[in-house]
């Protein structure tokens, strides 16, 4: 017996196509690219039917349904917009992922355009099915930092958002009797990492050993402008405290450390990371001007409680900044060798300041970043960390401030931040 002539489904075809179908003949129903066979609420690539002995087909011809990629996945620190009207998610529809500008930017600079493929997946030319990654934008404050042509020697009040990477690190070491409390500065490197000087995070309880303070004793404040008003600041506890393994307390060689924050901090106008330099041993060139910010909390008689809780006046309640020129290694070395004492300015350090002195150099709290504008990338880069000063401390004539040369440690920093020991797998832009 012959079976009735078959009509192929819309957006589909029947194979083989014959004038007559007899008992035991089989046909395969398939759909055009971007469509799938829909039968009994089931979706399949092809569907086979057979001409039965009684002249009827074993099943009805199924329909061809357009492939639907479904709602696109959300993007961390990004958003998705539909290029097609009515927010269509079907075959050949387009969407565009973008990052939360200006705080995040897309890794690999991809277009972020994804098309709904015939396979039912959102696909990008470069990344294929993988989602783009939004990385924090570093070294680009929402407010432009002052141009570096003028020599501003004295400390200035920083406007909110000028130094969005600036962190206040508060340490309360309860292993001491009474509890020991102190401050330092740091610089945000990513949503979860703070760069600082090792001596800020070293417990002074034991002298000839470098013992980091317990992570439980560390609090980091970000987006802080005035220590009397912490309402707008983000405070975070530490997940890990990592001192450079070769930190030397005798001469402060390798004075660099990292704090991993317990939770990633949300970035915004007042909280943004600083860029790391390229790994090169030269460090910043002499006469280059850099900026250092700090609250100038250098009065040992002021306790943490007074500042953090009641906001008692310190050297400065409001974040200050100062502009300083890099000094040649030879000049700095000579200035320290001419003084009594075994001060060693190593290759892991550089100096900055003015020959004529000026207490402005005090404004950079220990661990704060000495930042220089990189003309090539148009980003601010952390070239140094406030480390130490001579016996006269800051501001004396021909006693330069000594900074950790960050470019010597870039590989170590990346290694630590991306090590399996890191609490989370965190990506930061290199």
């Amino acid at each position: 017996n012959e079976c009735p002539k078959l009509q192929p489904p819309v957006y589909g075809k029947i194979e083989p196509s014959q004038a007559v179908y007899s008992f035991k003949d089989q046909v395969l129903v398939s759909c055009d690219t971007g469509y799938k066979v829909l039968k009994d609420n089931g979706v399949m690539d092809t569907f086979q039917i057979e001409c039965l002995k009684d002249g009827a087909w074993s099943n009805k011809i199924p329909t061809c349904k357009i492939v639907d990629c479904g709602a696109p996945a959300g993007l961390k620190h990004g958003l998705v917009t539909f290029s097609t009207r009515n927010n269509l998610t079907t075959y050949k529809s387009e969407i565009r992922y973008s990052c939360q500008q200006p705080y995040y930017k897309m890794l690999h600079n991809t277009t972020g355009v994804y098309t709904c493929s015939a396979h039912g997946t959102w696909t990008n030319e470069v990344l294929k099915r993988s989602l783009p990654t939004c990385l924090p934008v570093c070294g680009q404050p929402s407010r432009a930092l002052p141009n570096l042509v003028k020599r501003i020697i004295g400390g200035r009040n920083a406007e909110l958002g000028l130094f969005p990477w600036q962190a206040l690190i508060v340490v309360e070491d309860t292993s001491r009797v009474p509890n020991d409390k102190w401050f330092g500065s740091g610089a945000l490197l990513s949503e979860s990492w703070i760069l600082t000087a090792a001596h800020v995070l070293r417990s002074q309880r034991r002298d000839n050993t470098v013992i980091p303070v317990s992570k439980e004793h560390v609090t980091v404040y970000l987006g802080l402008h005035d220590v009397r008003d912490k309402s707008g600041a983000v405070n975070s506890s530490a997940a890990r405290v990592i001192l450079h393994p070769d930190f030397n307390i005798q001469n402060y060689n390798h004075d660099i450390a990292l704090v991993q924050l317990q939770k990633p901090v949300p970035l915004g106008a007042h909280v943004m990371p600083i860029c790391l330099p390229r790994p090169e041993p030269e460090g910043p060139a002499p006469h280059m001007l850099g900026l250092v910010a700090g609250w100038g909390i250098s009065n040992p008689n002021v306790t943490v409680d007074e500042i953090i809780l009641s906001g008692t006046r310190t050297l400065s309640d409001v974040l200050q900044y100062v502009k300083l020129p890099v000094v040649s290694h030879a000049e700095c070395k000579a200035s320290y060798e001419s003084r009594s004492g075994n001060y060693s300015v190593t290759e892991n350090m550089f100096c900055a300041g003015y020959y004529e002195g000026g207490k402005d150099t005090c404004l950079g709290d220990s661990g704060g970043a000495f930042v220089i504008f990189d003309e090539m990338s148009q980003h601010w880069v952390a070239q140094g960390l406030v480390s130490w000063g001579g016996p006269e401390e800051c501001g004396s004539k021909q006693v330069y401030g000594v900074y950790t040369k960050v470019s010597n440690y870039v590989d170590w920093l990346w290694e630590e931040m991306n090590s399996p020991r890191a609490v989370r797998d965190l990506q930061v832009e290199r």
Epitope: Q204, D207, N208
Partner: antibody
Framework: QIQLVQSGPELKTPGETVKISCKAS????????ITWVKQAPGKGLKWMGW????????TYADDFKGRFAFSLETSASTAYLQINNLKNEDTTTYFC?????????WGQGTSVTVSS | DIVMTQAPLTLSVTIGQPASISCKSS???????????LSWLLQRPGQSPKRLIY???KLDSGVPDRFTGSGSGTDFTLKISRVEAEDLGVYYC?????????FGGGTKLEIK
């Protein structure tokens, strides 16, 4: 080259205040704490306590809580011991020494005499 | 407070002969960090004390190797293999493990 230089001898009357200085040189002052030690004439050494030179937080032994105060002038790399309301039993030599637990370099000592 | 007991109070030694000083603490000086904070100091007549040994057995730079420190827990010893004239003075042991830190009463080394 590491040195701790203390201020000179003091002669005081009971009830007065004395402030002894200890100037450090040859190392980064804020790297090490400063410990204060008392030595009565012909007697042994007594640990009075120490001050963290980075945080400025002092720690006192029980016998030295109250009238005794440790302080710092970080910019001058100097630590101070102040004794208020002096008593005759405060007549002794006071030493400053580097570190909280190092005690590796010592000042020359400052002799305080309390006499009416 | 930890009591540090030194013995003997006085030690008379002939130059070139060995000497040994004992220091006992009322509690173990092993710290939670695995280190034992026990130092030996020498105070020569009319001078400030000078550290000779730290962490039980580590010799300070410039200290002659005739000095050796040993011990653990609560019992510690300072030995001088051959006493020299410059060694006379009062020797103190000191513990920096338990707060408040404490000195021993001192041992006076005399030359016979």
């Amino acid at each position: 080259q590491i040195q701790l230089v203390q201020s000179g001898p003091e002669l005081k009357t009971p009830g007065e205040t004395v402030k002894i200085s200890c100037k450090a040189s040859g190392y980064i002052f804020t790297s090490y704490g400063i410990t204060w030690v008392k030595q009565a004439p012909g007697k042994g050494l007594k640990w009075m306590g120490w001050i963290n030179t980075y945080s400025g937080v002092p720690t006192y032994a029980d016998d030295f809580k109250g009238r005794f105060a440790f302080s710092l002038e970080t910019s001058a790399s100097t630590a101070y011991l102040q004794i208020n309301n002096l008593k005759n039993e405060d007549t002794t030599t006071y030493f400053c020494t580097r570190g909280g637990d190092a005690l590796d370099y010592w000042g020359q000592g400052t002799s305080v005499t309390v006499s009416s | 407070d930890i009591v540090m007991t030194q013995a003997p109070l006085t030690l008379s030694v002939t130059i070139g002969q060995p000497a040994s000083i004992s220091c006992k603490s009322s509690q173990s000086l092993l710290d939670s960090d695995g280190k034992t904070y026990l130092s030996w100091l020498l105070q020569r007549p009319g001078q400030s004390p000078k550290r000779l040994i730290y962490l039980v057995s580590k010799l300070d730079s410039g200290v002659p190797d005739r000095f050796t420190g040993s011990g653990s827990g609560t019992d510690f010893t300072l030995k001088i293999s051959r006493v020299e004239a410059e060694d006379l003075g009062v020797y103190y042991c000191w513990q920096g493990t338990h707060f408040p830190y404490t000195f021993g009463g001192g041992t006076k080394l005399e030359i016979k």
